[in-house]
Interface confidence: low
């Protein structure tokens, strides 16, 4: 039981204190109550603290918590956010580059491909930039499009030159031979491969990151419950009820209530540790056709390789092609 | 062969991104992350003892505070009598996570099962599929160069790794960091409402 | 706790259209993928397309490419899906149901349903 | 084009153990997500990535899933069970998500 307070007591070192939280005075009493009302901070004895002071100090309890929170997962955010930013950017610096080399094989191997060929890349390059990024696209899709493009033109341009330019008619029966005779070989399947992998990992390893990212920012803004606003307020402001303005909390009385507090977020812990070990686990396989730089830095010389693969086989092809479509050549020659 | 595609650059910085030696690749910077993050591996479980050691708490001071009195720092009391006749700390332990912590849960259990099954065989089933095909021959050479393309005259060697950084310029300038603005952070200050 | 509102019942015509809406309310709205399925009475669920706000571009199920359109408006974050070409076969409930990014994620939260009734 | 056969009808006696099966060519290298759905209303998640529950979901919901057929096991069914099921795949071809015909689940 502590002692008593001296008959002539007052409660001004609370006032100017509560001053600070609660500008106007009215609610601190002018000297130490019975403080029946009382519900958090239960008295001893006479005290200097009253119903409204104590929700007040409730409020403060909960804001300090939640700016605690905020400032300790301050550095984490921060490094997941900045890396989140970093990986998005450079890995639209590889998409632009591999579209470089790829823009540069056309123009330096094959420039009479180029007016068409650097639109079809720049399509695929956009594709894949968005496909990084979650965009509902189909990998497969996207590089039969680009081959299904590139040989009407490879065909018209460097197997056929004398076909008129208006060749509209056999485009569409270029496209569809492109793919029933095989004509790039393994090629588009071997740029389906690579680009598939290496994409998907590379998509999956941004959205874990902006996952991280979410995670962070739902625990930062957690709000507390009533109950733990009460055993904060306990522990920090209690003490100036009794006029003990310098005292500070026991630290093991701070770690069991903090446990208290805090024990839906720490069940987030199993799962948050799983998922830096699965994002470490990604990350060391990222190498050769999981490695997005690696696969689309080289994309140049695998379509390069496979153009010259068709001109290898232009006779044999040329021959099939004008069977095959010559429908459609009749009807333009006319 | 494929002529070397470098005089396509369209926007000219590429070069030098392209040839710096000695700047970091995007697989080191991955790594790197990594690391980091790994530091904060025990993160949530280590947040109430973080959130009390950055707070006031008594730690040189014979007497502290224990929810109802004034006790030496070493009692029994000053962990237990604090928690008397208020409520059951179990209780509301056992009150489960908010909603909004379930469900970010969930969605981690997605995200970790996706990352699985990407790091799995089970997610990586075309990688014999290749070699069967004869695409790929082996690595060329044992530094960081790769072979990409087919055999013969039409290979050529491409640097593997994207010196990206140099474009980048991601670190972020001392005046931009946390805890370095001119804001009081609660680290500093202990929260302007604890007057010590 | 995402939540998924969809408009009201609707009775059409034969060759007219209908545009279903879906508002999301309590997640990020712009990075969740949504999709619409449907079924029709006594039958089973049939994807028809999905949309991710943040793109906006949406991939539509074969059997239903060149009549369905779906849509996403980020500021109010509602997802829409319109049918064309009406016949009484389209006769169902349509569903919006959101996922978190990317294959292979599961449908996480569904709308209430809107009936579709196709009758001249 | 993923195919996925579910049986139409399963029926279990209160407190038993109900096992619905979905078949599918090479099912186990796929993720199984599986779905309950009540009369006139909207389908839940029940299990997802083959053999994980969502939060609010009982433990008596289980799943498994290798070779060619994914199953979803209810222990102790309840009548509050009896509901049609459906599991789904993505297909990876088409990046599309494919559904099984579902099976209705009576509780005797």
């Known amino acids: 039981q502590p002692p008593p307070p001296p008959p002539d007591a007052t409660c001004h070192q609370v006032r100017s204190f509560f001053q600070r939280l609660q500008p106007g005075l009215k609610w601190v009493p002018e000297t130490p109550v019975p403080g029946s009302d009382l519900q958090v901070c239960l008295p001893k004895g006479p005290t200097c603290c009253s119903r409204k002071m104590e929700e007040k100090y409730q409020l403060t309890a909960r804001l300090n918590m939640e700016q605690l929170l905020q400032s300790a997962s301050m550095e984490l955010k921060f490094l997941i956010i900045q890396n989140a930013a970093v990986f998005q950017e450079a890995f639209e610096i590889v998409v632009r580059h591999a579209k470089n080399y790829t823009n540069a094989m056309f123009k330096n191997n094959y420039p009479s491909l180029t007016p068409q060929a650097f639109e079809f890349v720049g399509e695929f390059f956009t594709d894949v930039s968005l496909y990084i990024l979650g965009s509902d696209i189909n990998v497969d899709d996207m590089v039969n499009e680009l081959f299904d493009s590139l040989f009407p033109v490879i065909y018209t341009q460097l197997m056929n030159p004398g076909l008129p330019d208006s060749a509209l008619d056999i485009n569409e029966c270029l496209r569809g031979a492109r793919r029933d005779l095989k004509v790039f070989g393994n090629f588009p399947k071997l740029i389906m491969t690579q680009v598939s992998k290496s994409l998907q990992v590379t998509r999956i390893f941004l959205q874990a990151l902006n996952l991280g990212i979410e995670v962070i920012n739902t625990t930062d803004h957690l709000k507390f419950s009533k109950d733990c606003g009460r055993m904060l307020t306990r522990m920090w402001y209690c003490s100036y009820c009794q006029g003990l303005m310098m005292v500070k909390p026991c630290g093991g009385y701070c770690n069991v209530v903090m446990q208290g507090c805090m024990a839906g977020v720490v069940e987030i812990d199993k799962y948050w540790r799983e998922y830096i070990l699965s994002l470490e686990e990604l990350v060391n396989g990222m190498y050769r056709i999981y490695d997005m730089e690696n696969v689309l830095l080289g994309l140049f010389s695998t379509i390069h390789d496979s153009i010259q693969y068709v001109q290898k086989n232009a006779g044999k092809l040329t021959t099939t092609i004008g069977k095959l479509c010559a429908h459609s050549q009749q009807r333009q020659y006319r | 062969s494929a002529y070397y595609p470098e005089d396509l650059f369209i926007d000219k910085k590429v070069l030098k991104v392209a040839h710096v030696e000695h700047e970091e690749t995007l697989s080191s910077r991955r790594r790197e992350l990594i690391q980091k993050l790994k530091s904060f591996i025990s993160f949530y479980s280590a947040l109430p003892g973080y959130i009390c050691s950055h707070s006031p708490v008594a730690e040189n001071d014979t007497l502290c505070w224990n929810g109802q009195e004034l006790v030496e720092r070493y009692s029994q009391k000053a962990a237990r009598n604090g928690m008397k006749n208020q409520f059951n700390l179990h209780e509301l332990k056992m009150k489960g996570p908010e909603p909004v912590v379930s469900q970010i849960i969930d969605k981690l259990k997605h995200i970790n099962q996706l990352l699985r099954t990407m790091s799995m065989p089970k997610g990586r089933v075309l990688d014999k599929n290749l070699d069967e095909e004869g695409f790929e021959s082996g690595d060329c050479g044992d530094d960081e160069d790769e072979c990409i393309g087919g055999s013969g005259d039409g290979m050529i060697k491409v640097k593997n790794q994207l010196r990206f950084l140099a474009e980048l310029a991601y670190d972020l300038d001392v005046d931009d960091a946390p805890g370095n603005s001119q804001q009081a952070t609660p680290k500093d200050n202990e929260i302007s409402t604890f007057h010590n | 706790e995402v939540q998924l509102v969809q408009s009201g019942a609707e009775v059409k015509k034969p060759g007219s259209s209908v545009k279903v809406s879906c508002k999301a309310s309590g997640g990020t709205f712009r990075s969740y993928a949504i999709s619409w399925v449907r079924q029709a009475p006594g039958q089973g669920l049939e994807w028809m397309g999905g949309i991710i706000p943040i793109f906006g571009t949406a991939n539509y199920a074969q059997k239903f490419q060149g009549r369905v359109t779906i849509t996403a408006d980020e500021l109010t974050s509602t997802a829409y899906m319109e049918l064309s070409s009406l016949r009484s076969e389209d006769t169902a409930v349509y569903y919006c149901a959101s996922r978190i990014g990317q294959w292979p994620t599961p449908f996480d939260y569904w709308g209430q349903g809107t009936l579709v009734t196709v009758s001249s | 084009q993923s195919v996925l056969t579910q049986p139409p009808s399963v029926s279990v006696a209160p407190g038993k153990t109900a096992r619905i099966t979905c078949g599918g060519n090479?099912?186990?290298?796929?993720?199984v997500h599986w779905y309950q759905q009540k009369p006139g209303q909207a389908p839940v998640l029940v299990i997802y990535?083959?053999?994980d529950r969502p939060s609010g979901i009982p433990e008596r919901f289980s799943g498994s899933n290798s070779g060619n057929t994914a199953t979803l096991t209810i222990s102790r069914v309840e009548a509050g069970d009896e509901a049609d099921y459906y599991c789904?795949?993505?297909?990876?071809?088409?990046?599309?998500?494919?559904f099984g015909g579902g099976t209705k689940l009576t509780v005797l």
């Open positions: 090479n099912i186990g290298s796929k993720s």
């Open positions: 990535y083959d053999s």
């Open positions: 789904q795949v993505w297909d990876s071809s088409s990046d599309h998500p494919v």
